[in-house]
C-alpha cells in the first residue's frame, strides 16, 4: 500500500519569526565544538532596507518518503514563496495602481540558509527502519536576478561577505543544495 | 555536480602553520557541509573536523582542539583549513569532502585532490 | 572519544564473498550513526561506497552491499573482483562528531 504524502494548509510566517522543529537532543558532545564555531547568520539586505523588500516563508508539514518508506512523523519544511523586490513602484498612468520597472532587476525569494533534521524512517513489509538526515529550508532571502544574466546568475541583495567561523549560531543554521527547492516545489 | 579543487603541496618547519584551500565549483559553499579528513603516509584516514548542519556549528575533532581553525570566504566559494604548531607527525596528505547537496544529507560525497604538508626541520 | 574497529587484512578470492565489519568502542552500531563505507586505491583519494548503513550511489558497484550485522556496521562483496582490491575504511557519526575506522586492506587473490 503506496504511502500518502500529508500536508496541512500553508501557513504565512513573517521572516525571520518563524519556528522551527528542534532536532532532537543527540549525545551530550559539546566538547569538540568550536569555541567560535558557527556560521554568522546572513542578513541579505541592511535593517534600514528590510520593510521596502518582501519574502514570504511558508511552512508545510508532511511525511517523508525515501523509496517504500516513511518518516515516523510528519516534518515541518519551509517554502521560499512568491516574488520579492522594491516596494518603491514605478505609478503607472492611473497613478494608483504599482508596477515592476520593465528593465529592472528581478527579485527571487529563495532559500537562503538549511539546516539538517534527523528523520527516521518506517519502512513496509518488516524491513529495518532507516535513519536519514533531511535537508530543509531554514530561512528565505531575496536575490537579485538581473535580466540580461544567465538564470543561474542570481545575485545577493546586499553585500556577501566572507564568512569565517565566528560567533556561535543559533539554530536554524545551516543551509543546502539548490536541487532542494525544487523538490519542495514538486512536492507540493 | 560538485568539484573541489585544492591548493598545491607545502614544505613547512615545525612550529609553523599552514593554511590549505579547497575552492568550490558546481555548487556554492554556503550549500554545503565541508569537511577536513588527513591520511599521514602509509596510515589511515582521520577526520579532522567539518560543518554539521543539525547545529550550523563547526566541529573540529577533539585532538586537534586548538591547533585547527576552519573558515569559508564565500565571496570565493572557497574553504580553509589552517593548522598551527606543526610537528613532524602532522606531515599527510590533506582532503576537503563535501556532501551532494541531495535532499537527504549525504556527507563526504565528493573529495578533493589532496594537498600533502610536509613538516620537516 | 569513541574507538572505531576493523579487520586489519582479508583475502578473497575472485568471485568470492567477503564481509568486513565496523564497530564501535562506545557499543552496538546502529542506524543512527549512520555507517559510511569509503573504498581507497593507492595514490587515488578515497571515494564513498555506501551512506547511511546502506545507502548505496551512482558509481557504487551493485555486488557490494551495507547492513548491520551483529551490533556491527558491514560491507558485503559478493563476486569479488581483482579491481576490488583496495584499502575500506568505514565511519561513524557521533552526533556531529565522525571517526574513521583504522582500515581494511582487501586482498583479492
Known amino acids: 500500500q503506496g504511502w500518502q504524502a500529508f500536508r496541512n494548509d500553508a501557513t504565512e510566517v513573517i521572516p525571520g519569526l518563524g519556528e522551527y522543529p528542534e532536532p532532537p537532543p543527540e549525545n551530550n558532545q559539546t566538547m569538540n565544538r568550536a569555541e567560535n564555531g558557527g556560521r554568522p547568520p546572513h542578513h541579505p539586505y541592511d535593517a534600514k532596507d528590510v520593510s521596502e523588500y518582501s519574502c514570504r516563508e511558508l511552512h508545510y508539514t508532511r511525511f517523508l518518503t525515501d523509496g517504500p518508506c516513511r518518516s515516523a512523523k510528519p516534518v515541518t519544511e519551509l517554502v521560499c514563496s512568491g516574488q520579492c523586490g522594491p516596494a518603491r513602484l514605478l505609478p503607472n498612468a492611473i497613478g494608483r495602481v504599482k508596477w515592476w520597472r520593465p528593465n529592472g532587476p528581478d527579485f527571487r525569494c529563495i532559500p537562503d540558509r538549511y539546516r539538517a533534521q534527523r528523520v527516521q524512517l518506517l519502512c513496509p513489509g518488516g524491513a529495518a527502519p532507516r535513519s536519514r538526515k533531511v535537508r530543509l529550508v531554514a530561512s528565505c532571502k531575496c536575490k537579485r536576478l538581473t535580466r540580461f544574466h544567465n538564470q543561474s546568475e542570481l545575485k545577493d541583495f546586499g553585500p556577501e561577505t566572507a564568512r569565517p567561523q565566528k560567533g556561535r549560531k543559533p539554530r536554524p543554521g545551516a543551509r543546502g543544495a539548490k536541487a532542494n527547492q525544487a523538490e519542495l516545489e514538486n512536492a507540493y | 555536480e560538485v568539484q573541489l579543487v585544492q591548493s598545491g603541496a607545502e614544505v613547512k618547519k615545525p612550529g609553523a602553520s599552514v593554511k590549505v584551500s579547497c575552492k568550490v565549483s558546481?555548487?556554492?559553499?554556503?550549500?554545503?557541509?565541508m569537511h577536513w579528513v588527513r591520511q599521514a603516509p602509509g596510515k589511515g584516514l582521520e577526520w579532522m573536523g567539518g560543518?554539521?548542519?543539525?547545529?550550523?556549528?563547526?566541529i573540529y575533532a577533539q585532538k586537534f582542539q586548538g591547533r585547527v581553525t576552519m573558515t569559508e570566504d564565500t565571496s570565493t566559494d572557497t574553504a580553509y583549513m589552517e593548522l598551527s604548531s606543526l610537528r613532524s607527525e602532522d606531515t599527510a596528505v590533506y582532503y576537503c569532502?563535501?556532501?551532494?547537496?541531495?535532499?537527504?544529507?549525504?556527507?563526504?560525497?565528493?573529495w578533493g585532490q589532496g594537498t600533502l604538508v610536509t613538516v620537516s626541520s | 572519544q569513541a574507538v572505531v574497529t576493523q579487520e586489519p587484512s582479508l583475502t578473497v578470492s575472485p568471485g568470492g564473498t567477503v564481509t568486513l565489519t565496523c564497530g564501535s568502542s562506545?557499543?552496538?552500531?546502529?542506524?543512527?550513526?549512520?555507517p559510511y563505507w569509503f573504498q581507497q586505491k593507492p595514490g587515488q583519494a578515497p571515494r564513498t561506497l555506501i551512506s547511511d548503513t546502506d545507502d548505496k550511489h551512482s558509481w557504487t558497484p551493485a555486488r557490494f552491499s551495507g547492513s548491520l550485522l551483529g551490533g556491527k556496521a558491514a560491507l558485503t562483496l559478493s563476486g569479488a573482483q581483482p579491481e576490488d582490491e583496495a584499502e575500506y575504511y568505514c565511519l561513524l557519526d557521533y552526533g556531529g562528531t565522525f571517526v574513521f575506522g583504522g582500515g581494511t586492506k582487501l586482498t583479492v587473490l
Open positions: 562506545t557499543g552496538a552500531v546502529t542506524i543512527d550513526h549512520y
Open positions: 560543518f554539521d548542519p543539525e547545529d550550523g556549528e563547526t
Open positions: 558546481g555548487y556554492t559553499l554556503t550549500e554545503l557541509s
Open positions: 569532502a563535501t556532501d551532494s547537496a541531495g535532499y537527504w544529507y549525504k556527507f563526504f560525497q565528493h
